[in-house]
Amino acid sequence: FDWQYINPVAHMKSSAWVNKIQVLMAAASFGQTKIPRGNGPYSVGCTDLMFDHTNKGTFLRLYYPSQDNDRLDTLWIPNKEYFWGLSKFLGTHWLMGNILRLLFGSMTTPANWNSPLRPGEKYPLVVFSHGLGAFRTLYSAIGIDLASHGFIVAAVEHRDRSASATYYFKDQSAAEIGDKSWLYLRTLKQEEETHIRNEQVRQRAKECSQALSLILDIDHGKPVKNALDLKFDMEQLKDSIDREKIAVIGHSFGGATVIQTLSEDQRFRCGIALDAWMFPLGDEVYSRIPQPLFFINSEYFQYPANIIKMKKCYSPDKERKMITIRGSVHQNFADFTFATGKIIGHMLKLKGDIDSNVAIDLSNKASLAFLQKHLGLHKDFDQWDCLIEGDDENLIPGTNINTTNQHIMLQNSSGIEKYN
């Protein structure tokens, strides 16, 4: 039985390797900022928004084009509880969380914290959905690059208990004194997987739509009191969104969330699924996606049953694209790929054979070209149109996975096992 089909990061869940490499890991990354700066012309700002304060509200990290470039960089993982959540997710002792905190607690990401929004322009909006065991801050390389090219990016923190950790406030007075209530990753029994993962992906889609509604409300001038006491005036966002130019992007479980969200909410004009983990999706969604959809896959994560489900989204009359990044692994899309040195990165499957900067660059440029095409942007991102077709030495058009004769097998399967 292969757990990868029902858990996209099963390979990271062995605790034996962790202790052996703590010292090496510390040497590889202590206190450094390795997450790449955006390649675009805009400076990038970052803030957090929670509204309302309850676990039914919206919690997101916002990346945006900023007015100035002289603020402090953004703390990458902002609370100790996130490290505890990560250690639980990795199946290690909670003390490992303290070691992770020691290693990465002071690491920053290159965005200006609470910097004012760059005024005078309406920006397209991307809602971003994180993967299983992640949270809102762990895809900053993508968020920052998009923001540097003139997007506002809302990276949602999901409250479906697929995040390693997240928090909310039990009531208004708790919010006022900053008394956080923490919600950690839910571990599932095998027999729960199909049902619960589908419940989670539905909740995640609702949270993406709710995040969009909140930002559009703010854009319309609705006064919103951020439950987090931050020095960023949300009123800056009034009239800042190009309301017709909205997309959804996500990684892994977030890739499935992209598809679920597109099928439920036509305010999203297109979607990009980064190494999507398709298992959580119900069969009913595949034929309900009128929006253009782009699959960007890693070479080493994908497997026939997953690719077959991606192909179920295809229809001759709809816009669907797929590319695969040569030599890449599942974690090439998340920030942890930049947090360690080469050897450790390889050992932990955080890095593939391809250079992490090259991989994220290809993914981001292909995404920008796709977004320009389907949001009708008047930019120069069409210079990367060839990447959408997989036309690059580091790309494979479509997939490297052979799915011949897999269709019958998939129909006869319970949908949990992975075929080799």
Epitope: R269, K311, Y314, S315
Partner: antibody, heavy 116, light 112 residues
Framework: QVKLEESGPELVKPGASMQISCKAS????????MNWVKQSHGKNLEWVGL????????TYNQKFKGKATLTVDKSSSTAYMDLLSLTSDDSAVYYC?????????WGQGTTLTVSS | DIVMTQTPLTLSVTIGQPASISCKSS???????????LNWLLQRPGQSPKRLIY???KLDSGVPDRFTGSGSGTDFTLKISRVEAEDLGIYYC?????????FGSGTKLEIK
Amino acid sequence: QVKLEESGPELVKPGASMQISCKASGYSFTVYTMNWVKQSHGKNLEWVGLINPFNGDTTYNQKFKGKATLTVDKSSSTAYMDLLSLTSDDSAVYYCVRFWEGIDFWGQGTTLTVSS
Amino acid sequence: DIVMTQTPLTLSVTIGQPASISCKSSQSLLYINGKTYLNWLLQRPGQSPKRLIYLVSKLDSGVPDRFTGSGSGTDFTLKISRVEAEDLGIYYCVQGTHFPFTFGSGTKLEIK
């Protein structure tokens, strides 16, 4: 139930242009693409092109590029086909057809006669 | 363009007898998603076409089960187990896998 209601028959002069409409009901208009098919001499069927009502993306049969233009009005769930520079060869019955798992549900057809 | 070759051109059948129509495509109609977009249509006199079968073998709702579709790749067949009077008209195969979508030339079913 699904309904595709096309505009009535037309008699037009050569060189003129005209528009055929197709009002959809009974399903989610923006989820399914709308195709247009030409039937000449009561037999021959030719695919003109399709439009995705969600975003207006079109794909045309090369043969009808410059002859047909497809548009939609989402607010009224209506698809349109404009036919330009008409000649007697354009005389035919034109159908709007929904796409679901292939060419699916057909409108009743609009008869176009081009004659001076 | 994909050529859809339909045979025979005309079919004369006695009521209650079986009938079979063949459709061959010039290229495989298997799409990337594993589906084959080959449909069969019936156009009764004075009416617009109506789909009977989609994805080679699936019956549209309300279509009697005396109709069956079969085939794969480039070779497809429509069979009627026992022809009834209401079955007369022109039968078309149509492919929706490759642009431009293309139709067979039609098979006229007559009642003997």
